[in-house]
C-alpha cells in the first residue's frame, strides 16, 4: 500500500482467482484512544472499533472510503483504492490502447517547435467517475523540471456504438534551450482512477522525436504565363522555432483531386515556393517537416487550383 | 521551370554541402547498424544516450545563434579555448565566436574520427565479420575537416591490448552513432545558419 | 495487370514525321499521366513529353518543343507520339510510359523502334 | 536544364559483392530523384523514388539515399539478376532529366 495523496491509498493486489489479498491497516488520524467506529462509503453498518483497523483487502467490494467517528462525528477518512496486477502485468482498463506508432501505446505526445512545451493525449470509453493527475520530468534519476497543467476532456468521438473521449495535457519544461542536444529523456506519468480502480501510464521520449510543425501558413498561387504551371509559395509557421535559417523545414508540395487514389503531382523543396501542375478541381497542398531531423510531417495546409 | 529564389551561393560556405553530406552519411550508417544488428540493443530506446565531447566541447553554446544568447537556459558557462584560425568563411567574415564555434566542430569531428576508427579496427577482427563502419562516412568526416582547416594536436588512435569484446564493441558503435548524428545535426544547423548570415 | 502496348518498328525518310501509338489496358486510362521517353542507340534515356489523358493537358521538353506533339483517345485508352522534321538523330526506341505520379514512371511499354534513314 | 552525372559509367562487381553508384545534379534538387534498372532490350524499371523510398516488389537489397545534389544507389548484394544499365532521374523542375547511366557489368 502507498499514499497516492493526502487520505488516498493505492493498495496493489495480484489479481487471479482466490487470490489472499492485502491485509492493510488504517489509522484514525486523531488524538482519540477510545469510543471510535469504523464504516466504509454510505453504509452504517459497523466494520470494527478502536483506532487502527485491519482489513483484508481482495476486490473492488473491499476498496472505498473508510471513515472513523466517534459519537456521531467524523474524525478522518482513508480512500483505497486497488491497482491490479494479472499474470504479472499492471492493468490497462481506463485508458484504451492507440496502436501508433506500436502496440502498447496509450500517451501519445507531440511538440510543435524546441521550446520545451509538448502536449499529451489519452484516448477512453469511459464517460464518469473518471480523474486524471500527470507529473513530468526530464530524466528520472536525477529529474529536471517539467510543469504540467490539468489534463482536460478535448473531443468527443463516436466509434461505431461506442463514444470515444479524447483528454489532453500541456507540459512545458522548466529550463529549456531550443538549441540543445536532448540526452536525457523526458518522462511522463499520467494516473488515472475510474471509481475504486487506479492505473498508471508513462511515456518516455525525447523532445525532438515528438516535433510536428504546424503546416505552413499563408499559402498563395501565381499562375504562369502560357503555362498550365503555377507557382505556389508559402510560409513558415508562426509557431515554429526561430531563427529559422538554424531551425530549417524542408516541404512536400502535392496537387490531387478529392480522391487518394486519383494522380499527383508532387515535388519536395527546401525553399518557400515550388512549381507544379494544377488541374481542375485538384488541391495543392503543402507540408513541413524538421530539415535536419525527420520526425513526423505536419498536417497539410491547402488551396484549391481553381 | 522553378522561379529563381534568392540564395546565398553555396561557394561562399563550402562547409554547408560538407555538413549535409556528413549527416546523410551518418544517418545511413544508423540506419545500417539498426538492421544488422536487429538483437542488439541499438534503437535510441534501448540505449545510453552518451555525449563522447562532453566537457571537451562546447559546439552548442560555441554555436548559439544570436538570437538565442538571450534564452538564459542556453547559455552554460563553460569556458573552453580553441584554436582561431578557420578557413570555412573569408577571414573577414570571421569573427572571434565564429571561429570558436568552427573550431569547437572540428574538435567534434576529430574526437568521433578517433573513436570510429578505433572501434573499426575491432570490428575488423570480429570472426562473424558482422559490420563495419562505412567508408564514406568517415572520408565525409575528413572531408568536413580539410574544409574547417583548423590545426591542431593529432589525437593518437587508441590501442588495446586485450581482446575485443565484440558485444561491447558493437552496442558501444551504436551509442557513438546515435550521438554522432544529434551532433551532426546540431552541425549541419549551425552551418546553414552561417550561411544565411 | 497494367500493360502499355506499343505500335511496330517505323523506319522514315529524313523530313518526314512518324506517329507511335501506345494503348493502355488495366486500370482506367484517364486515372495515369502518360510520358514519352526515347533511347537512341547505345545511349541513354531523354524525356520527351508527358500528357494528362483527362484534359489533354501536355507539357514538352524544350528540345522537342515544335516538331512534338502528344495526343490521348480515351474512348480507344490509347495515346499518340508525333514526331515531324525527322533527322537521323531521331533513330531511337520510343517507349510509353504511365505513372499516377506525374513526375516519375512505374510502368513502361515495350519501345518502338523508329528508324530514320534516306 | 537539371543536369544529372552519374559514376561510374561502367562498374565492374563480383556477384554478392555491394556496389554503389553515384548521381550527382547541376543544382540542389531536394529528395526528387528516383533510380531505374533496364536490362538490354527490355523496357526501364523503377527501383526507388524520391530518393529513398523503396517500391513494392522491388528486392530489399536495392537502397538510395541523398538529398541536394548527391545521391547513392546501393545493391548490397549483387544477384546474376542485377548486371544491367541503371539510371537516375530527377523531378525538380522540367524537362525531366536522366543520367547518362551506369552499366553494372560482371567482373
Known amino acids: 500500500i502507498w499514499e497516492l495523496k493526502k487520505d488516498v491509498y493505492v493498495v496493489e493486489l495480484d489479481w487471479y482467482p482466490d487470490a489472499p489479498g492485502e491485509m492493510v491497516v488504517l489509522t484514525c488520524d486523531t488524538p482519540e484512544e477510545d469510543g471510535i467506529t469504523w464504516t466504509l462509503d454510505q453504509s452504517s453498518e459497523v466494520l470494527g472499533s478502536g483506532k487502527t483497523l485491519t482489513i483484508q483487502v481482495k476486490e473492488f467490494g473491499d476498496a472505498g472510503q473508510y471513515t472513523c467517528h466517534k459519537g456521531g462525528e467524523v474524525l478522518s477518512h482513508s480512500l483505497l483504492l486497488l491497482h491490479k496486477k494479472e499474470d504479472g502485468i499492471w492493468s490497462t482498463d481506463i485508458l484504451k490502447d492507440q496502436k501508433e506508432p506500436k502496440n502498447k501505446t496509450f500517451l501519445r505526445c507531440e511538440a510543435k517547435n524546441y521550446s520545451g512545451r509538448f502536449t499529451c493525449w489519452w484516448l477512453t470509453t469511459i464517460s464518469t467517475d473518471l480523474t486524471f493527475s500527470v507529473k513530468s520530468s526530464r530524466g528520472s534519476s536525477d529529474p529536471q523540471g517539467v510543469t504540467c497543467g490539468a489534463a482536460t476532456l478535448s473531443a468527443e468521438r463516436v466509434r461505431g456504438d461506442n463514444k470515444e473521449y479524447e483528454y489532453s495535457v500541456e507540459c512545458q519544461e522548466d529550463s529549456a534551450c531550443p538549441a540543445a542536444e536532448e540526452s536525457l529523456p523526458i518522462e511522463v506519468m499520467v494516473d488515472a482512477v475510474h471509481k475504486l480502480k487506479y492505473e498508471n501510464y508513462t511515456s518516455s521520449f525525447f523532445i525532438r522525436d515528438i516535433i510536428k510543425p504546424d503546416p505552413p501558413k499563408n499559402l498563395q498561387l501565381k499562375p504562369l504565363k502560357n503555362s498550365r504551371q503555377v507557382e505556389v509559395s508559402w510560409e513558415y509557421p508562426d509557431t515554429w522555432s526561430t531563427p529559422h535559417s538554424y531551425f530549417s523545414l524542408t516541404f512536400c508540395v502535392q496537387v490531387q483531386g478529392k480522391s487518394k487514389r486519383e494522380k499527383k503531382d508532387r515535388v519536395f523543396t527546401d525553399k518557400t515556393s515550388a512549381t507544379v501542375i494544377c488541374r481542375k478541381n485538384a488541391s495543392i497542398s503543402v507540408r513541413a517537416q524538421d530539415r535536419y531531423y525527420s520526425s513526423s510531417w505536419s498536417e497539410w495546409a491547402s488551396v484549391p487550383c481553381s | 521551370r522553378n522561379l529563381p529564389v534568392a540564395t546565398p551561393d553555396p561557394g561562399m560556405f563550402p562547409c554547408l554541402h560538407h555538413s549535409q553530406n556528413l549527416l546523410r552519411a551518418v544517418s545511413n550508417m544508423l540506419q545500417k547498424a539498426r538492421q544488422t544488428l536487429e538483437f542488439y540493443p541499438c534503437t535510441s530506446e534501448e540505449i545510453d544516450h552518451e555525449d563522447i565531447t562532453k566537457d571537451k566541447t562546447s559546439t552548442v553554446e560555441a554555436c548559439l545563434p544570436l538570437e538565442l544568447t538571450k534564452n538564459e537556459s542556453c547559455l552554460n558557462s563553460r569556458e573552453t579555448s580553441f584554436i582561431t584560425n578557420g578557413s570555412c568563411l573569408a577571414s573577414r567574415k570571421t569573427s572571434f565566436m565564429m571561429a570558436l564555434c568552427l573550431s569547437s566542430i572540428y574538435e567534434d569531428l576529430k574526437m568521433y574520427q578517433v573513436e570510429f576508427k578505433t572501434m573499426n579496427a575491432k570490428l575488423l577482427m570480429d570472426p562473424k565479420r558482422q559490420i563495419f563502419l562505412d567508408q564514406n562516412m568517415l572520408a565525409v568526416i575528413d572531408e568536413l575537416m580539410q574544409a574547417l582547416n583548423f590545426n591542431s594536436e593529432t589525437v593518437p588512435q587508441k590501442s588495446s591490448l586485450e581482446e575485443p569484446d565484440f558485444y561491447k564493441t558493437k552496442i558501444k558503435l551504436c551509442i557513438l552513432l546515435h550521438a554522432f548524428r544529434i551532433r551532426a545535426v546540431t552541425i549541419d544547423r549551425v552551418m546553414s545558419y552561417l550561411n544565411a548570415s | 495487370q497494367v500493360q502499355l502496348v506499343q505500335s511496330g518498328a517505323e523506319v522514315k525518310k529524313p523530313g518526314s514525321s512518324v506517329k507511335v501509338s501506345c494503348k493502355a489496358s488495366?486500370?482506367?486510362?484517364?486515372?495515369?499521366?502518360l510520358h514519352w521517353v526515347r533511347q537512341a542507340p547505345g545511349q541513354g534515356l531523354e524525356w520527351m513529353g508527358w500528357i494528362d489523358p483527362e484534359n489533354g493537358d501536355t507539357e514538352y521538353a524544350p528540345k522537342f518543343q515544335g516538331r512534338v506533339t502528344i495526343t490521348a483517345d480515351e474512348s480507344t485508352s490509347t495515346a499518340y507520339m508525333e514526331l515531324s522534321s525527322l533527322r537521323s538523330e531521331d533513330t531511337a526506341v520510343y517507349y510509353c510510359?504511365?505513372?499516377?505520379?506525374?513526375?516519375?514512371?512505374?510502368?513502361w511499354g515495350q519501345g518502338t523502334l523508329v528508324t530514320v534513314s534516306s | 536544364d537539371i543536369v544529372m552525372t552519374q559514376s561510374p559509367l561502367s562498374l565492374p562487381v563480383t556477384p554478392g559483392e555491394p556496389a554503389s553508384i553515384s548521381c550527382r545534379a547541376s543544382q540542389s534538387i531536394s529528395i526528387n530523384l528516383h533510380w531505374y534498372q533496364q536490362k538490354p532490350g527490355q523496357a526501364a524499371r523503377l527501383l526507388i523514388a524520391f530518393a529513398s523510398q523503396s517500391i513494392s516488389g522491388v528486392p530489399s537489397r536495392f537502397s538510395g539515399s541523398g538529398s541536394g545534389t548527391d545521391f547513392t544507389l546501393t545493391i548490397s548484394s549483387l544477384q546474376p539478376e542485377d548486371f544491367a544499365t541503371y539510371y537516375c532521374q530527377q523531378s525538380n523542375s522540367f524537362p525531366l532529366t536522366f543520367g547518362q547511366g551506369t552499366k553494372v557489368e560482371i567482373k
Open positions: 488495366g486500370g482506367t486510362f484517364s486515372d495515369y499521366y
Open positions: 510510359a504511365r505513372n499516377k505520379e506525374l513526375r516519375y514512371i512505374d510502368v
